[in-house]
Structures are given as C-alpha cells and as structure tokens.
Interface confidence: low
C-alpha cells in the first residue's frame, strides 16, 4: 500500500498493487530476414526470435507476425538495437561527381499501431548517414524510451534496409519491452 | 495484490509483492585500466569504481573483481555505455595500399558468467568500425537491455582494446543494472 | 510484502510498497530551439515539449523552463536521444592544410542541478568526434542510465551546438525519466 | 563452399552415451546457429537441439533435453552432440544443420545404430 | 509444443501434373519452411520463409499460406521430383517437422 503496510484507518483510495513478477515483459532476438514486399516510402519490418537463446515473452506478452501485441494498458520502457553491416558507401564518389549529394542513410524506426487509428505512430526514430572511406562497415543504431500504451497496440520495428540488416548473432540485433 | 487492494475472500495465489527501494541495483562508472593479460580471442573485462562519485551498489547487489554479481533471479535491466577515443585509423591509406581492408573496429560486449556453464553467454554487443579521415577521433557506444538472470550469475563488460577506452570522467563511460 | 501476501505473525519492518501506475515520469519531446544566451565554455540547455502529442509528465514530476523537477527522491533512471545534423565537417581539409587537427564533434550531456549545491552535476555523456567525407550528415546520440536523485533536483539535458539539433520530429530528439 | 560433416561410432551399447562431432568449413561457424537432427528408420525428421557458437547458448527439444548435450569448439570449427542412456529407440540417422534464422544447409547424415 | 500435421501421407502424380501438399499448424506460426529428402540422402532446402526459393531451387517448386495454413506446390512434376517433402516450423520450442509426403510418379 502507498507508503505504509498497512491500509490506515480513515477510508482512502489507493491505486492497485501487482507483483513485478508478473507485468509484460518481451526481449526478442534477431533472426535471419526474409526479402519481404513492402509499400513505397514504407520501411519493412524485421521479424524476430520470441523463445530461443535470450529471447522470451511472458506474462501475456505476445509475439506474432513481427509484432508485439501489448495485453495491458500502461506506461513500457520499450527499445531496440539495430546492428548494420555493409560495403563502402559511395558518397565520396557521388560527392566528386557532381551528383546530388544526399548521403546513403541507415535508419531504425520502432513504430506503434492501433487498430482503430488509420495512420502507424513512430515512437522512437534513430537514423544515420553513411558515408564510410573504409571497405566494409558495421554500426549499430540503439533506442530506448518510455511511452503510454494501450491494451491491444501492437509493436513493430522497422528498417529502411533489411538487406544491411546484421542478423548473425542474437547479441547484435534486439527488440524489448515491459510495463513499468 | 494483483489488481485489487486486499485479498479476495475467495482463496487465490498472488505472486509476492516487494518494495521497489529493496531492489538490487548498481551503477558503475569507469576507473583508470591497467592493462592485463587476456587469453587471445577473449576481449579483456573492464574494472569500475562502485562507490565514489555517481557510482553506488545496493540492496545486496555486489561489485567485485570486474564483476557485478547478481544476488536474486529475476528479469534485469542491464546497461553500459563506453566512450572509445583513438587516432586516426589507417583503414583509408590500408585500403589504397591494397592490404587486406577489413576496418579497425571497436566493441562492446556485457557478459554474463554462470559457474554452471563452461561457456560465458554474450547478452549484449555494440560493434562499429572505425574508419576516421580526421585525425583523434571519439565515440560512444550504448547498449542496453533487460534479461532474465539467475542468483549467482556475474555480469562484466569486455572491449575489443581496453587502450581506447576513455576512462577520464564517469559520466562518459559506465556500467548498471537493476532488477525490474 | 516482500516475500509473501501477509504480513508474518512475527513484527518485521518493510519498506513500504507503492502502486507502480503513481510513479513520477516524464517524455518529453523536442520543439524547435530559439537561440539563447549562454555562458563561455557552457552548453546551451534544450527545451521541451511535455504534453503534446508523444510527450507527458505525470505523478507529480514537472517540467518548466528546460528542466524536470524531481518530485520524489529515489532511483530514476533516466534517458535521451538528441539527433544532429549538419554540413560537411571539414575536419579533412583542416588536416591538410595543417592546422590543428581536432576534430569537430557533437555532445550531449545530461545534468543534474541541485540548489544546494554551487555546481551541476553531470550525469551522463555521450561525444563524439564528427569527421564526414560527404556533405549533409546526420546521427543520434543516446544515452541512458540510473541514478539517486533528491526531490527537488532538476535535470536538463545540454548540447555542444544548438544549431545542429534536429527538431522536425518528436521521435528524433526526446529526454525522459521514470522512478524505479 | 559450405560443408558439414558428421562423424563417430556407428554403432553404440544400450545404456552408453552416443557421441557425435559435427566439422564444418566453408563458413564462419560463428556467423550461424548449428542444429542437430535426427531420423529413426522409417520415420519422419526430429529436431534435438541447437547451439549459437558465437555465445554458447543452447535450446534442447524437451523431449530430449534431460539426455543431450550440445557443445562447440570454435578453434576446431566443430560442434558435438551427446546423448546419453541410449536405447534401440535411439537408433537414427544423425545430421548437423547450419542455419542463420532458418536451416540452410545440412551434413549428408551418420548412421548410428544402438544394439548390444 | 506445435503440432505440424501434413497432408496427404503419400500421393502418386503423372510427369507435367501440378502437385500440391499442405501443413496445418497447431497454433499460428509466422513462416514455414519445406525440404526436399531423396531415399539415403540429407534433406534439401526448398522453400524459406513460406514462399522463398532457396538457392538454386527451380521456379517449378513454390510456397505460400499464412497463419496456420501453408501450402507447397509443384507446378509440374518431373521425374527427378520423386521424394519425401517435409515441412518445418521454427518458431516454437521444439522446431517441430510435419511427418512427410512421399511423392511417386504413377
């Protein structure tokens, strides 16, 4: 009970108490990508590893088709972990040529439905250019914040690129949330 | 309780409720390394002040010997960030020589050791190549998750060269973890 | 209870527990910066958006004039993202022309101010040295951990250079902190 | 290119551990996930387990679980499978599968066969 | 556990027919995945992530359903098609496989 054990003596209104133990909780690990179809101008969603390894959902926590379906209303720390690996970006090259000199980019993005609104809420965005003079390049994007959800949104992280998408290791590539 | 103030009349089993300030939580901020020997392939673990300054160990959560030692199963927020400074990498003149042009790199692994287990397990790994056309360069590397731990596990943060890591204030690199 | 449901017959005493949903927290999300004023050698603090859209503070935790106020003293953990953005650094040039070769770079710092104390805290940082060999750049800095903080703190978040902060959306650039 | 190949006894006593090396090139074996499965005689296939040899981390088919052991050697590019207090029951064709998030690639199988 | 159950057991097609084998799981998986079994051999990937060609798999094979439902089809039988097919869930614990069709030619 707030701030005391037991429930003074004049009548008050407390809100509920739970055991941590059982709040909505999900660490799901990366797994190798599939080309998938997607709309124009619209990232693709990764899909994930739900029990294997490190991975896990409990509490009513679900995972399904790329998403993690909220059970209860409440505020969750949600984040992810993108590690990104591919060739040299030619942006040098573009730059020298002449051509137009928007740098290569690698984005995450975890994204929000709700069935009733028409329209996906982009929680939390970390996006990079990529204009490496090296060979191969390899960076992760890191995201992490506190949001107020509702019972039966869904959660999504999606990718402007799956193909440069690190999927070797469950270390590298995560996504997470739990109710606070 | 779960969901309600008192207990139902009805018999029911909750799980057990607990005080958040009795929760096992540390964080460690980053002391001056001395170098050590590490068996090759391994990366070297960091050591960490956890009692000076913004550091602080509590509630049986206990640092010692470059491990924070975890002293009740649960599921653990676990934390790190390590800001890496260095000179310039040569990875631009190694490419124009025509070596081999694999980047410099730098890494970031939170290990979790489990004297039951022979093999310590990779919870987290933050990776970026370094290929710097400047000449000192600095960055972080963030990483942050929530894992299901047991009573005994030890957690430790490893690098890929313990020489890069800047150690010189400890808002800039640190360690941290706390039961949900 | 810790432990279990009721109390034991035996007196014991027991931090008091507390329903997690009245827990002070806060998301703020960024708004676009007026340039302001500030000391030699000190960042420049962000302001905030606290209500609109992605953002909120509730349970008493307030914001007003850059800073949250720390309702409650206990463990928070707290967080931010700030996305820059920005010309080509011309750290290349400056090298081969043979001026000093330290590099241009970007920070982010997390502070606490506490009345009682004559300086502010800083709790978190996140730097790093800006190098690009294309033109327009672009990248997050996040940062993220836990500390003990007294009621009536007061927490901002500063940045090396105001004018790189990118403001178009409340997912790019956002600060929070929650009680644990 | 990729290869798998599995190698051991082929034949084992009832009650005796079965034990079984899987070797690999062609490949980063840290780069995948290394699964074990088998095939009894004229029967389907049964997935036992697999292992991320980057980590270590393991996940066992319950219904074998209290019985097998999947370990690496990264140094070797190998990975073994125990399986211990064997029966006629166990008696199979053993295949290791290389897969990076789905199976991909397998060895060409090593008879084993459980008899006294 | 997830339960594969694939259907028919057995099926014997004429060389140019369109063959068609489907695997129902016991609870809703994201994607499923085939192989190919020649008599004494390995298994082969055939189809990933429901409707993908593996590598160097001819267009003849494909893959598709959703849910619990998933469908393998052969467009046109030929002789050197004559195998067990078998699909695999991977997302549940254990990876369980479907029993296998055998197909023959008639």
């Known amino acids: 009970l707030k701030g005391q054990e037991f429930a003074p003596s004049h009548q008050q209104v407390y809100a509920p108490l739970r055991a941590d133990g059982d709040k909505p909780r999900a660490h799901l690990t990366v797994v190798r990508q599939t080309p998938t179809q997607h709309f124009k101008n619209q990232f693709p969603a990764l899909h994930w590893e739900h029990e294997l390894g490190l991975a896990f959902t409990k509490n009513r926590m679900n995972y399904t088709n790329k998403f993690l379906l909220i059970p209860e209303s409440g505020d969750y720390f949600i984040y992810s972990q993108v590690t990104f690996r591919g060739m040299t970006s030619e942006c040098s090259e573009i730059r020298q040529a002449g051509r137009p000199n928007k740098p290569d980019s690698i984005t995450v993005v975890i994204t929000k439905v709700t069935d009733s609104y028409p329209e996906p809420t982009q929680l939390l965005m970390g996006t990079k250019s990529v204009c490496e003079v090296g060979s191969n390049w390899f960076q992760p994007i890191y995201l992490g914040a506190m949001f107020s959800l509702q019972e039966g949104d869904k959660l999504m992280v999606n990718v402007s690129d799956i193909s440069l998408v690190d999927y070797t290791k469950e270390d590298k590539t995560f996504f997470g949330a739990f109710l606070l | 309780l779960k969901g309600q103030e008192f207990a139902p009349s009805h018999q029911q089993v909750y799980a057990p409720l607990r005080a958040d300030g009795d929760k096992p939580r540390a964080h460690l901020t980053v002391v001056r390394q001395t170098p050590t020997q590490h068996f090759k392939n391994q990366f070297p673990a960091l050591h960490w002040e956890h009692e000076l300054g913004l550091a602080f160990t509590k509630n049986r959560m206990n640092y010692t010997n470059k491990f924070l030692l975890i002293p009740e199963s649960g599921d653990y927020f676990i934390y790190s960030q390590v800001t890496f400074r260095g000179m310039t990498s040569e990875c631009s003149e190694i490419r124009q020589a025509g070596r081999p042009n694999k980047p410099d790199s730098i890494t970031v692994v939170i290990t979790k050791v489990t004297d039951s287990y022979p093999e310590p397990t990779q919870l987290l790994m933050g990776t970026k190549s370094v290929c710097e056309v400047g000449s000192n360069w600095f960055q972080p590397i963030y990483l942050g998750a929530m894992f299901s731990l047991q009573e005994g596990d030890k957690l430790m943060v490893n690098v890929s060269d313990i020489s890069l890591v800047d150690y010189t204030k400890e808002d800039k690199t640190f360690f941290g973890a706390f039961l949900l | 209870l810790k432990g279990q449901e009721f109390a034991p017959s035996h007196q014991q005493v027991y931090a008091p527990l507390r329903a997690d949903g009245d827990k002070p927290r806060a998301h703020l999300t960024v708004v676009r910066q007026t340039p302001t004023q500030h000391f030699k050698n000190q960042f420049p603090a962000l302001h905030w958006e606290h209500e609109l859209g992605l953002a909120f503070t509730k349970n008493r935790m307030n914001y007003t004039n850059k800073f949250l106020l720390i309702p409650e003293s206990g463990d928070y953990f707290i967080y931010s993202q700030v996305t820059f953005r920005g010309m080509t650094s011309e750290c290349s040039e400056i090298r081969q022309a043979g001026r000093p070769n330290k590099p241009d770079s970007i920070t982010v710092v997390i502070t606490k101010v506490t009345d009682s104390y004559p300086e502010p805290t800083q709790l978190l940082m996140g730097t790093k040295s800006v190098c690009e060999v294309g033109s327009n750049w672009f990248q997050p800095i996040y940062l993220g951990a836990m500390f003990s903080l007294q009621e009536g703190d007061k927490l901002m978040v500063n940045v090396s250079d105001i004018s790189l902060v990118d403001y178009t959306k409340e997912d790019k650039t956002f600060f929070g902190a929650f009680l644990l | 290119q990729v290869q798998l190949q599995e190698s051991g006894p082929g034949l084992v006593r009832p009650s005796q551990t079965l034990s079984l090396t899987c070797t690999v090139s062609?490949?980063?074996?840290?780069?995948?996930?290394i699964h074990w499965v088998r095939q009894r005689p004229g029967r389907g296939l049964e997935w036992m387990g697999r292992?991320?040899?980057?980590?270590?981390?393991?996940k066992y088919n319950p219904s074998l679980k209290s019985r097998v052991t999947i370990t690496r050697d990264t140094s070797k590019n190998q990975v073994s499978l125990r399986l211990s207090s064997v029966t006629a029951a166990d008696t199979a064709v053993y295949y290791c599968?290389?897969?990076?998030?789905?199976?991909?690639?397998w060895g060409q199988g090593s008879l084993v066969t459980v008899s006294s | 556990d997830i339960q594969m159950t694939q259907s028919p057991s057995s099926l014997s097609a004429s060389v140019g027919d369109r063959v068609t084998i489907t695997c129902r799981a016991s609870?809703?998986?994201?994607?499923m995945y085939w192989y190919q079994q020649k008599p004494g051999k390995a298994p082969k990937d055939l189809i990933y992530?429901?409707?993908n060609l593996a590598s160097g798999v001819p267009s003849r094979f494909s893959g598709s359903g959703s849910g619990t439902d998933f469908t393998f089809t052969i467009s046109s039988l030929q002789p050197e098609d004559i195998a067990t097919y078998y699909c695999?869930?991977?997302?549940?614990?254990?990876?369980?496989f479907g029993q296998g069709t055998k197909v023959e030619i008639k």
């Open positions: 599968a290389r897969s990076g998030g789905m199976t991909d690639y």
């Open positions: 062609g490949f980063d074996l840290q780069d995948t996930y």
């Open positions: 292992i991320d040899p980057a980590s270590g981390h393991l």
């Open positions: 609870f809703s998986v994201d994607y």
């Open positions: 992530a429901t409707s």
């Open positions: 695999q869930q991977w997302e549940g614990n254990p990876r369980s």
